[in-house]
C-alpha cells in the first residue's frame, strides 16, 4: 500500500513518510487511481500492479488486484485505475452460475442434436435439436451420447469438470 | 482536547442485538476515518469495522461481516456500531477509535458487551 | 490476511534495563502503516509509535521504533515503573488492519 505525504499542519501522529503522489480530495472524493487518507486531507495514488480504484471515491484502501487463476490467461494487466482483465483459456469456459473456474466444454452435441455455436471464453458449445430447432439445456444427461466424427465408434461421455 | 466517549453497552442474549454510540469532541469529527475495536476478557485487540470521514466506506472484520454495521452522523459527531445476531464469542470491551491505517492515534474508554443466557 | 507475532510472550526485566520487543508480519507491510501501543489494565490503549519509526505525541524519547519490510521492533531503552504493561503492534498496510498477540513486560 501507498503511504502519506507529510504535511505541516497535520498531527503529528496522522503524518507518515512521503513514498506517493498526493492531490487534493475534491467534495471530499479522489480520483480513480487513488484512495482517500484517513484524515481526509490528501488522495493517495494506489500501488501499480498491486491495486486500484475505477471511480472518484473516499475508498481508505484501493482495491486489490485480481490474480488469473490456473487455466486463465491474462488479457490485460492491473494498473492503477483498472483491474485485471482475465479470460478462460482456449477450450474452457466460465459460466454466469459458476463464475469462480473455468469448465471445460463440451467435445460435441448429443445424438440428435447439431451445433450451432462454438466454444467460446464465456459460453460452452451451443446445440440444437436437428428437428425442432430449441436449444440444448446445456446439461447433460448421466449417459450421453456425442456425435463423433466417424460413425459406429462408440460414443464417448461429455465432461464438464474443469 | 479530543475526547471519545462510547455508550451502549450492556448484557444481551445470543442471537439479540445492540447498538453502540461513540460521541466524539475536540477535533473536526467529519474529516476523520473511524474504527470500532474490540478485547475480550483477558485477549488481545482485535479490529473490528472502519468507516471513512463521509461514511461512504465502510470495512468490517470476517467475523462480523454481515452482522454489524457501522455507520456516521457528522451532524452528531457521533460513530455508531449496530450489533446484530449477536454470539457469545462477541463478548468483549468495544472501544472507538480515531484512525485506521496509519494508527488509532486516540481511542474512548471502551464499553463492554456481555453476550450470555 | 497479514499475521503479526509478536516475541517474546512475556518479558521478565528490571527498572532502568533495556527491553527489546518483537513484532514479526506474516508478508511484507509498508513501514507507513505500522504501529505499536502500550495497554495497562483497565485502561484503553495508548498510541507509542506510528510509521514504525515515529513517536506519538507526548509519548518518552526512551520508546522508539525501527525495521521495515516483515521485521520490526519496539526498543524502551531504560524501564521505568510506569512502563511495566503489555505492547501491541499493528499494520494498516493491507485489509483487514490486524494487531499482534500482546507482549507483556512484567517485574522481575
Known amino acids: 500500500e501507498s503511504a502519506l505525504i507529510t504535511q505541516q499542519d497535520l498531527a503529528p501522529q496522522q503524518r507518515a513518510a512521503p513514498q506517493q503522489k498526493r492531490s487534493s480530495p475534491s467534495e471530499g472524493l479522489c480520483p480513480p487511481g487513488h484512495h482517500i487518507s484517513e484524515d481526509g486531507r490528501d488522495c493517495i495514488s494506489c500501488k501499480y500492479g498491486q491495486d486500484y480504484s475505477t471511480h472518484w471515491n473516499d475508498l481508505l484502501f484501493c482495491l486489490r488486484c485480481t490474480r488469473c487463476d490456473s487455466g486463465e490467461v491474462e488479457l490485460s494487466p492491473c494498473t492503477t485505475t483498472r483491474n485485471t482483465v482475465c479470460q478462460c483459456e482456449e477450450g474452457t469456459f466460465r459460466e454466469e452460475d459458476s463464475p469462480e473456474m473455468c469448465r471445460k466444454c463440451r467435445t460435441g452435441c448429443p445424438r440428435g442434436m447439431v451445433k450451432v455455436g462454438d466454444c467460446t471464453p464465456w459460453s460452452d458449445i451451443e446445440c440444437v435439436h436437428k428437428e425442432s430447432g430449441t436449444k440444448h439445456s446445456g446439461e447433460v444427461p448421466a449417459v450421453e451420447e456425442t456425435v463423433t466424427s466417424s460413425p459406429g465408434t462408440p460414443a464417448s461421455p461429455c465432461s464438464l469438470s474443469g | 482536547e479530543v475526547q471519545l466517549l462510547e455508550s451502549g453497552g450492556g448484557l444481551v442474549q445470543p442471537g439479540g442485538s445492540l447498538r453502540l454510540s461513540c460521541a466524539a469532541s475536540g477535533f473536526t469529527f467529519s474529516s476523520y476515518a473511524m474504527s470500532w475495536v474490540r478485547q475480550a476478557p483477558g485477549k488481545g485487540l482485535e479490529w473490528v469495522s472502519a468507516i471513512s470521514g463521509s461514511g461512504g466506506s465502510t470495512y468490517y472484520a470476517d467475523s462480523v461481516k454481515g452482522r454489524f454495521t457501522i455507520s456516521r452522523d457528522n451532524s452528531k459527531n457521533t460513530l455508531y456500531l449496530q450489533m446484530n445476531s449477536l454470539r457469545a464469542e462477541d463478548t468483549a470491551v468495544y472501544y472507538c477509535a480515531k484512525g485506521v491505517r496509519i494508527s488509532f492515534d486516540y481511542w474512548g474508554q471502551g464499553t463492554l458487551v456481555t453476550v450470555s443466557s | 490476511e497479514i499475521v503479526l507475532t509478536q516475541s517474546p510472550g512475556t518479558l521478565s526485566l528490571s527498572p532502568g534495563e533495556r527491553a527489546t520487543l518483537s513484532c514479526r508480519a506474516s508478508?511484507?507491510?509498508?513501514?507507513?502503516?505500522l504501529a505499536w501501543y502500550q495497554q495497562k489494565p483497565g485502561q484503553a490503549p495508548r498510541l507509542l509509535i506510528y510509521?514504525?519509526?515515529s513517536r506519538a505525541t507526548g509519548i518518552p524519547d526512551r520508546f522508539s521504533g525501527s525495521g521495515s519490510g516483515t521485521d520490526f521492533t519496539l526498543t524502551i531503552s531504560r524501564l521505568e515503573p510506569e512502563d511495566f504493561a503489555v505492547y501491541y503492534c499493528q499494520q494498516g498496510s493491507n485489509q483487514p488492519v490486524t494487531f499482534g498477540q500482546g507482549t507483556k513486560v512484567e517485574i522481575k
Open positions: 508478508q511484507s507491510v509498508s513501514s507507513s502503516y
Open positions: 510509521g514504525a519509526s
